[in-house]
């Protein structure tokens, strides 16, 4: 089994307020078994944006189907972006367990929000 890598190819993404933001994340291995979660920010104050195993997350949809056995694309789309959504988003793999434990994080994608065009 190859070592898992989490690839967030975009260092930054800029979106106009009211539009949708696509945050890309792919993984290189199906192992270890466990869910992907997205967070805004790092450390204890980070905010959960999406969890593959729970929800709903009304403004978040997955670009690919994350329940599909062979899926390695965990990119998400966040709708109706507001300035409060600005920040750095991390795609993080957890190892299945009781509870699940953080295994590896992507490098992060910084989302900046432009003023809505008038």
């Amino acid at each position: 089994e190859e070592e898992l890598q989490i690839i967030q190819p975009d260092k930054s993404v800029s979106v106009a307020a009211g539009e949708s933001a696509i945050l890309h994340c792919t993984i290189t291995s199906l192992f270890p078994v466990g869910p992907i979660q997205w967070f805004r920010g790092a450390g204890p104050a980070r905010v959960l944006i999406y969890n593959q195993r729970q929800g709903p997350f009304p403004r978040v949809t997955t670009v690919s189907e994350t329940t599909k056995r062979e899926n390695m694309d965990f990119s998400i789309s966040i709708s109706n972006i507001t300035p409060a959504d600005a920040g750095t988003y991390y795609c993080i793999k957890f190892r299945k367990g009781s509870p699940d434990t953080e295994f590896k994080s992507g490098a992060g994608t910084e989302l900046s929000v432009r003023a809505k065009p008038s």
């Epitope: 599909k68 056995r69 062979e70």
Partner: antibody
């Protein structure tokens, strides 16, 4: 108890179209991916098509790609398979199946329940 | 397609194993029992080792490397059937094995 009831089979003409419907009960329909599987007379099982729990993602077997459309109505707890340009080799018993809380369309290792089947005969 | 033996046989009370290989890198397998052609299959194992509530504990499933195994302990005459394995290939398409005929001797 989980039940999956298929309907819509019968005698079909080559080149025509069919629409099979599966109604699920006894489980939270909107939480489970669904698949259609068929079995030609004297042959083994063949996967036809599958659909994700929310209906956003659909998957098709090579034999029906471009001729089939799978859809679902979670409010009615139904999944539909439409198959166009029917051929003699589409003659089979078609089974509706439910995934048991894992996987999606095409992930046959997750099937935990089967319908009784509906027979389709394509003949002139 | 998945690869499984065409036939296996066992005496009542014995243990029988049926193997299946060729699934995608997820290496997950389901097992489906069909007692007669045209009758609806019955899931005996899904997601490698999960057993539906109405299936006897004599049926178990496991996987090792890329091979799935269905094990039936204390085989009974009523277990005589064709057993199909199912999975998905690396493209995500559903695949079945050709079926293994279990004959219970005696």
């Amino acid at each position: 108890a989980v039940t999956l009831d298929e309907s819509g089979g019968g005698l079909q003409t080559p080149g025509g179209a069919l629409s099979l419907v599966c109604k699920g009960s006894g489980f939270t329909f909107s939480s489970h991916a669904m698949n259609w599987v068929r079995q030609a007379p004297g042959k083994g099982l063949e996967w036809v098509a599958g659909i994700s729990s929310d209906g956003r993602f659909t998957y098709y077997g090579a034999a029906v790609q471009g001729r089939a459309t799978i859809s679902r109505d979670n409010g009615q707890s139904t999944v539909r398979l439409q198959l166009n340009n029917l051929r003699a080799e589409d003659t089979a018993t078609y089974y509706c199946t439910k995934n048991g809380g894992c996987g999606s369309g095409g992930d046959l290792d997750c099937i935990d329940a089967w319908g009784h089947g509906t027979e389709v005969i394509v003949s002139s | 397609a998945l690869t499984q033996p065409a036939s296996v046989s066992a005496n009542p009370g014995e243990t029988v194993e049926i193997t299946c290989s060729g699934g995608g890198s997820n290496n997950a397998y389901g097992w489906f029992q069909q007692k007669s052609p045209g009758s609806a299959p019955l899931t005996v194992i899904y997601d490698n080792g999960k057993r539906p509530s109405d299936i006897p504990s004599r049926f178990s499933g496991s996987k090792s490397d890329s091979t799935g195994t269905l094990t039936i302990t204390r085989v009974q005459a009523e277990d005589e059937a064709v057993y199909y394995c199912g999975s998905a290939d690396n493209s995500g398409a559903g695949v079945f094995g050709a079926g293994t005929t279990l004959t219970v001797l005696g």
